[in-house]
């Protein structure tokens, strides 16, 4: 299986002045003796060989290298130097790659389980011998390092003094390329197909493709405006409308097949237009409205759908009142005209100065339609007066008005004089005759139940919990900022998000350390240490492994004897003093009168028999939050995640090198930076617009619609470029018009119209 | 060399319940995408479903979800499909299938296929 | 989910003839269309990835192409061995889906 990350060893130095072995023989000589005249000059091969494993506060060199382990070819002989770790030394092992060559120093250690961030490196030098396998002998250093190291690019340098060489090296701990978090245990591959479609940001989130959403990715985003309750899509900018549904944006409902006056809310009706009805809205409810069929004055009484009935006037009947009985009696003639009765009813001949049917008809002078331009005319008795409409003057309506004196545009760059009319030319945002409409541009584009606000020459969508963007289509990844401390896995929920912590973690950020020494899994009588996510035990001397539970073999060396005081005369060291084993390897013996004895302690042990490790602890010398381990005349501290040195008191600022953006301002936290945006910036290196669209993004009249992290201008007639910068028209490129104004090109020659404020020829 | 080995297939009751397995050697198996595909006697391919071992993604075919199960043990580095539920019409040769995946490319294509198992669905 | 149409269904052809196959979806799949080969009785083969990439080992008789909606394999002089039924998929989005074959035989 592929490994979730790699420890890295970089030997960069060596120096074994004298070229001899651990046990002070020489490399090369026989017999392994030191000679009298030291050891001659590079008689060593010199290898080495790393072991990986859990922490140890006592490092034991046996046992297992739980973590792993690697070796080196013979890098050189009593000392040598290699490139060290970081930029310079990667070009150099650069150039011996590119020549063929191995990193000769480098050793490369995979694991495949989660990092537990605290470990044990043992390194040892060796002289490489031809004929025999490693054993004690060849060993010319062994030095070990315990502590803790996070996954990150950067180089760890470690300094060793042994007892014969000393050792130059650096160390790091790297994730494989698709696993993130301080742990590497947190997987993310990016892929493109119907898993998902996404990259991984530098915490191993996914981030969605353009066209894609949702936490996975796999959600396709669809066409802009598209109502997602009628409608849906499974690839980017479709529109695929749910059965019962049409239109480009699924907003419009299919009627029942076959109906003609009627409409729907919900698909499948025929809710009827006024005065129709029937299933297909096609019985028409008024037959006398739309057809009058009553003549001669009768009177029409709508009956059944497309039935009606006449009620005539005097004189008159049929079906329609079409048929005349004595028409003259009612003297319909007007006037002093002579009615005759004909068959159809009656016939008036009038007298001079009067027509019509009735002779009900003033023949005047406005018969021939004098008033010119949709005049209208008054007949008098004298003659006639035309009533002009606003655009013309003059006896006859024949003289243009100058509509533009009256200032008749509201939200207009200018207003020109046409013949019978005026043109305003509406800023964007505006229409009707006057401009003074205000354009609705809500429609439907808010999406996920978004509430639309019309601005001019725009809108704005009010967003439910959840979601963002400029049409609510992104839902809000909580899970964006990385919220979740302690190599937690974050998932997003449509309310907010929730945090998966690792064993260790608790909270609603995993920021909690659960205390792992409660109860204590120390056997043994052992003392627990917590940890960040894992914990401690200080095996006493006779107990071992994780838990101390391994028991240790008390008397390496063989059975115990009894002893009489000290059992040893008094040595060199100190007057009545002794190193017998009563006082074990930490104290000194001295017999008193009677076989008895007393121990002399060495620094930082205490008892009887100078067996207890006086705890360096008890004052609590860590700082914030730093976990203490005592050791022999000294402690360590384990810093929490932000923390480092050796009391846990440097916070490294997080601020360098500066990762805001756009003028931003950091802030240094622990283990974290914020980032104080200007105006008009968000995210969390304040590198996104708040809002891509302003009143200036796009030019000549252009629209500005805003997607997220990015615009697009709709440009109008005769204008291109991501601004509507550029004109089609020759005349207008490039724009001569200065402080947005609009170019207006004829042939070679423009013209320029200024937004308010500004004047002259190019705006200027 | 790449290798997919399936097993389990067999006779089985309507509404009854198997399990398959898909043994893979010869690749890194957490790099890949593993998918079931099966073919009805006489007819065409039909896709199950399928898994990301590296992180545990599955996804099913509208006609086996509910019913089928897909997971897998990277230790062991094997696949399982576990069908419960089964009707006549599941019957058919399931084959195992790896797909290599990278965001450069869409439709990388299931370059191995294991030899197939049967399974009949009757009573 | 995705359809994927295949034509013809079958066909009948000469050893070195060319034949072309094409593959229609019921939606936009961008490039993600694979083409396999299956002989009676074993696993298919994969021939072509990405609408348009030979896979490693496949005869460069054998081509594909198309995007969004439409697709083709094309075999440019058929030979013995490629009497076979063959198979278009997408992988893009939803759940994969293969088309209905298309059985090529000997004339």
């Known amino acids: 299986a592929r490994p979730m990350g790699y420890f890295e060893l970089q030997l960069s130095a060596l120096r074994n002045v004298n070229g001899e072995l651990l046990s002070g023989a020489c490399c090369d000589g026989d017999g392994r003796t030191t000679r009298a005249g030291g050891c001659g000059h590079d008689e060593c091969d010199t290898y080495v060989r790393v072991c990986l494993k859990e922490y140890q506060a006592k490092v034991t060199p046996t046992g297992p290298c739980s973590y792993g382990h690697g070796a080196t070819p013979v890098l050189g002989g009593n000392s040598f130097y290699l490139p060290p770790a970081g930029a310079a030394g990667d070009r150099a092992r650069a150039r011996a790659r590119a020549g063929g060559d191995q990193d000769p120093g480098l050793v490369v250690i995979p694991f495949q389980f989660a990092w537990p961030r605290s470990f044990t490196l043992i390194v040892e030098a060796w002289d490489w011998d031809n004929d025999t396998t490693p054993n004690e002998e060849l060993l010319i250093e062994r030095v070990s390092h315990a502590g803790m190291i996070n996954p990150e690019d950067r180089w760890k340098s470690l300094h060793f003094s042994g007892h014969v060489a000393h050792l130059e090296l650096q160390i790091r701990v790297r994730c494989d390329e698709n696993y993130y978090s301080a742990t590497c245990n947190k997987f993310c591959r990016p892929r493109n197909d119907f898993f998902g479609h996404y990259t991984c940001d530098q915490y191993g989130n996914k981030a969605c493709m353009d066209g894609w959403m949702g936490k996975e990715c796999k959600e396709a985003v669809c066409k802009q405006g598209c109502n997602l309750l009628h409608g849906g899509c499974t690839v980017p900018g479709e529109c695929r409308c749910s059965y019962g549904w049409q239109g480009r944006f699924c907003d419009e409902c299919v009627p029942y097949p076959g109906c003609v006056h009627g409409s729907c809310v919900e698909p499948w009706q025929c809710n009827c237009e006024t005065n129709w009805g029937g299933l297909l809205c096609d019985k028409d409810l008024n037959y006398c409205g739309s057809h009058h069929p009553c003549t001669n004055g009768g009177t029409c009484i709508n009956a059944e759908p497309d039935q009606y009935r006449c009620t005539c006037p005097d004189g008159y009947s049929g079906r329609n009142c079409e048929k005349a009985e004595h028409a003259c009696t009612s003297n319909p003639c007007a006037n002093g005209g002579s009615c005759h009765e004909v068959p159809s009813g009656f016939e008036c001949h009038c007298p001079s100065g009067w027509s019509g049917p009735t002779c009900a008809l003033d023949i005047d002078e406005c018969a021939s339609n004098p008033c010119a331009a949709g005049g209208t005319c008054v007949d008098q008795v004298d003659g006639f007066e035309c009533i002009c409409p606003e655009q013309w003057v003059g006896a006859t309506c024949q003289l243009d008005a100058n509509e533009c004196e009256g200032k008749p545009c509201l939200n207009a760059f200018s207003c020109k004089n046409l013949i019978g009319g005026y043109y305003c030319d509406c800023i964007p945002g505006w229409k009707g005759i006057n401009c003074h409409i205000n354009v609705n541009d809500c429609r439907g584009q808010c999406q996920h139940g978004g509430t639309c606000k019309d601005l001019v020459n725009g809108y704005q969508c009010v967003c439910p919990r959840g979601f963002g963007g400029r049409h609510c289509e992104l839902e809000r990844d909580e899970c964006a900022s990385s919220p979740c401390h302690s190599g937690g896995l974050c998932e997003d929920l449509a309310d907010g998000f929730h945090c998966h912590c690792p064993q260790g973690f608790s909270g609603p950020l995993c920021e909690v350390d659960v205390d792992l020494c409660e109860p204590s899994p120390c056997r043994n009588g052992a003392r627990c240490y917590n940890l960040e996510g894992d914990y401690y035990c200080a095996c006493p001397d006779d107990f071992g492994g994780k838990n101390c539970s391994v028991p240790r073999e008390p008397c390496p060396g063989g059975a115990c004897r009894v002893i009489d005081g000290c059992g040893s005369d008094a040595g060199p060291g100190m007057p009545g003093t002794a190193a017998s084993g009563v006082c074990g390897p930490h104290g000194r013996c001295v017999s008193q009168p009677g076989g008895n004895f007393s121990c002399i302690c060495d620094s930082g042990f205490t008892g009887t028999y100078c067996h207890e490790n006086i705890d360096d602890c008890l004052g609590q010398p860590c700082r914030n939050g730093g976990t203490c381990i005592d050791e022999v005349d000294a402690f360590r501290c384990f810093c929490p995640s932000g923390w480092e040195g050796e009391l846990c008191d440097t916070n490294p600022n997080d601020c360098l090198p500066d990762p805001c953006h756009s003028r931003g301002r950091c802030y240094d936290l622990v283990n974290d930076f914020y980032c104080a945006c200007d105006d008009g910036w968000k995210g969390k290196t304040c590198h996104s617009r708040e809002f891509q669209c302003d009143a200036y993004t796009c030019s000549n009249g252009g629209t500005c619609y805003d997607s997220g992290d990015t615009f697009r201008c709709a440009c109008p007639p005769g204008w291109k470029g991501s601004t509507c910068a550029v004109a089609k028209n020759s005349s207008c490129l490039p724009n001569p018009c200065v402080n947005g104004g609009t170019c207006v090109g004829s042939g070679a020659s423009f013209s320029c119209i200024c937004r308010d404020g500004w004047e002259g020829r190019t705006c200027t | 060399e790449v290798q997919l080995v399936e097993s389990g297939g067999g006779l089985v009751q309507p509404g009854g319940s198997l399990r398959l397995s898909c043994a893979a050697s010869g690749f890194t198996f957490t790099s890949y995408d593993i998918h079931w595909v099966r073919q009805a006697p006489g007819k065409g391919l039909e896709w199950v479903g399928g898994i990301s071992p590296a992180d545990g993604d599955t996804d099913y075919a509208n006609s086996v979800k509910g019913r089928f199960t897909i997971s897998a043990d990277t230790s062991k580095n094997t696949a399982y499909l576990q069908m419960n539920s089964l009707r006549a019409e599941d019957t058919a040769v399931y084959y195992c299938a790896r797909n290599d995946y990278d965001v450069r490319t869409v439709g990388s294509g299931m370059d191995y296929w294991g030899q197939g198992t049967l399974v009949t669905v009757s009573s | 989910d995705i359809q994927m149409t295949q034509s013809p269904s079958s066909l009948s052809a000469s050893v070195g003839d060319r034949v072309t196959i094409t593959c229609r979806a019921s939606q936009d799949v961008s490039t993600a269309v694979a083409w396999y080969q299956q002989k009676p009785g074993k696993a298919p083969k994969l021939l072509i990835y990405?609408?348009?990439f030979l896979y490693s080992g496949v005869p460069s008789r054998f081509s594909g192409s198309g995007s969004g909606t439409d697709f083709t394999l094309t075999i440019s002089s058929l030979q013995p061995e490629d009497f076979a039924t063959y198979y278009c998929?997408?992988?893009?989005?939803?759940?994969?889906?293969f088309g209905q074959g298309t059985k090529v035989e000997i004339k």
């Open positions: 990405s609408a348009s």
């Open positions: 998929q997408q992988s893009y989005t939803s759940a994969p889906t």
